[in-house]
């Protein structure tokens, strides 16, 4: 019997498309699973077959390519919907095969509805703009391959529900939207609607993305440790709980990994025998600057623990810093009857 290499359901590719719009979906086999492309496969005599499984059942069926107006068609390794319908939602399978070879993968496709203000369950890509950084652009995404370069589509941009025209610092320029100087007030969802003709029909492509204005690299600084600092001394008696917060401010930096960690006597807490716990919390400013707090806690501190060196470290793409906490053992208050009496020369 025939074996088929089944890559299962590729949930990494959660494809979402809008109802009543064209959609072109590439077979993921050639992008993620196989080491050759469609052209090579085709010239080697392999055939690409498409199936789908309806949203509410488990049995796959061949895709019907004989629908009116060729609503669903295949071109090379691309499955085309012109346009989609709500009940096209389901799991799609592309299978590459000949008499001796077979490989297949399934992926989910969700056809979603949008309202007149482009609100929908669609997961939106986020585009970050630097605050007050000069001209920056966003581009209408995922429209390549829908129409030939000879076709000149019309593109309309919206912020939320409102068509962008005569905005102070936002200018539509075809497929691009330019921000002359990005401000916090530019945060929001931006939608481009691309309209193009094909075979006497008019199609619309709707693409929404979220713009988030973030801290500018011009203002970025290395991590700043606010705590521990030289003004606070952690003075404890043995048996008490020792709590030392390490609070670090990180400027927003694109793709930077912000790290905070404690060392005790130069070692990571995991590498030493004392019973220490560390709890972390993270907060963000409106421009995505980050404040991380790691609280080091020793439930019942010993006099040995109070002699150790506790250092908070922080690192970002801008640099690395460290700060030691001032920890000392509290000197017990003198007991009057004995110590003070002795001090006054009582016999």
């Amino acid at each position: 019997s025939e074996r088929c290499d089944d890559w299962g359901l590729d949930t990494m590719r959660q494809i979402q498309v809008f109802e009543d719009e064209p959609a072109r979906i590439k077979c993921p086999l050639f992008e993620h699973f196989l080491k050759f492309n469609y052209s090579t496969a085709h010239s080697a005599g392999l055939t690409l077959i498409w199936y789908w499984t309806r949203q509410d059942r488990d049995l796959e069926e061949p895709i019907n390519f004989r629908l009116p107006e060729n609503r669903i068609s295949k071109e090379k390794d691309v499955l085309w919907f012109r346009p989609t319908l709500l009940n096209d939602t389901g799991n799609y399978t592309c299978m590459l095969r000949n008499t001796t070879y077979c490989s297949k993968v399934a992926f989910p496709l969700e056809v979603v509805q949008k309202d007149s203000c482009f609100n929908s369950p669609m997961k939106l890509p986020v585009h970050k703009l630097y605050i007050e950084y000069g001209i920056q652009r966003i581009t209408c995404p995922n429209v390549d391959g829908y129409f030939p370069s000879s076709v000149k589509p019309t593109i309309t941009w919206y912020m939320g529900c409102y068509k962008i025209q005569n905005f102070n610092n936002v200018i539509p320029e075809g497929m691009n939207l330019s921000f002359l100087i990005a401000l916090i007030s530019n945060n929001g969802n931006y939608t481009c609607v691309v309209t193009y003709p094909e075979n006497g029909r008019t199609f619309h492509l709707t693409r929404t993305l979220t713009v988030k204005v973030v801290g500018s690299p011009k203002n970025a600084v290395p991590p700043v440790i606010h705590s521990p600092n030289d003004h606070v001394v952690y003075e404890k008696e043995p048996g008490e709980e020792l709590l030392i917060p390490c609070t670090v401010y990180f400027s927003f930096l694109m793709d930077s990994r912000n790290e905070v960690w404690w060392t005790i006597d130069g070692k990571k807490p995991d590498d030493i025998t004392i019973d220490v716990t560390i709890n972390e919390s993270i907060s963000h400013s409106r421009t995505e600057d980050e404040t991380r707090t790691q609280i080091l806690s020793i439930k019942k501190v010993t006099s040995e623990d109070l002699k150790r060196s506790y250092v908070c470290h922080a690192r970002s793409a801008k640099g690395e810093v460290a700060k030691a906490a001032k920890v000392k053992q509290k000197v017990p208050a003198p007991r009057y009857t004995v110590e003070l009496a002795c001090g006054f020369g009582a016999t």
Partner: antibody, heavy 116, light 111 residues
Framework: SLEESGGRLVTPGTPLTLTCTVS????????MSWVRQAPGKGLEYIGV?????NLYYASWAKGRFTISKTSTTVDLKMTSLTTEDTATYFC??????????????WGQGTLVTVSA | AAVLTQTPSPVSAAVGGTVSISCQSS????????LSWFQQKPGQPPKLLIY???ILASGVPSRFSGSGSGTEFTLTISDVQSDDAATYYC???????????FGGGTEVVVK
Amino acid sequence: SLEESGGRLVTPGTPLTLTCTVSGIDLSSYAMSWVRQAPGKGLEYIGVIGSSGNLYYASWAKGRFTISKTSTTVDLKMTSLTTEDTATYFCARYTIDSGIYTYDLWGQGTLVTVSA
Amino acid sequence: AAVLTQTPSPVSAAVGGTVSISCQSSQSVYGNNELSWFQQKPGQPPKLLIYGASILASGVPSRFSGSGSGTEFTLTISDVQSDDAATYYCAGGYSSTSDNAFGGGTEVVVK
């Protein structure tokens, strides 16, 4: 057309493979099913092999029955046969039309007799 | 697994008369209409009569009709002919294909 073969008299516990040979049917475009009928009894669903090769068995058939296919045949492999498995085994095309599946084309069946 | 329960056998019908056979599913069939009816004569494979609860299969006389939705279905044979003497089976398709099932069959005797 569909033609089943491989049915014969076997003793309990003997494995047996039945073959459904198809002609004029592209098995990459159709689901195929196996159904059996004990003498004087009703039809009983065994399972389906989907057009892309996915498998769907009746709960009672899981583990003992295995469906597979090549470009021109659909096989039913049976293990641990008992006298209860004595039946005529049919293969049927499980076709979808307007989103509705049905068994639209049947073979003549092949008789399996399990007897000590 | 789904269970399909048919009218107890046998059912008698006079030539020229009408006979109805019922089929009840323990759960709703897929799309509320994925139910088929088959005719089987001794020594022959089943023959498809109706699919989609009410769609007449190609080449089947219009004397046969199907109705129903969800879990309750009926096959009706009007102007019964002697050639209609056979056993009739319903078959259901479900969201989970493993639940597919056939009814126990109803024998129609023509007098």
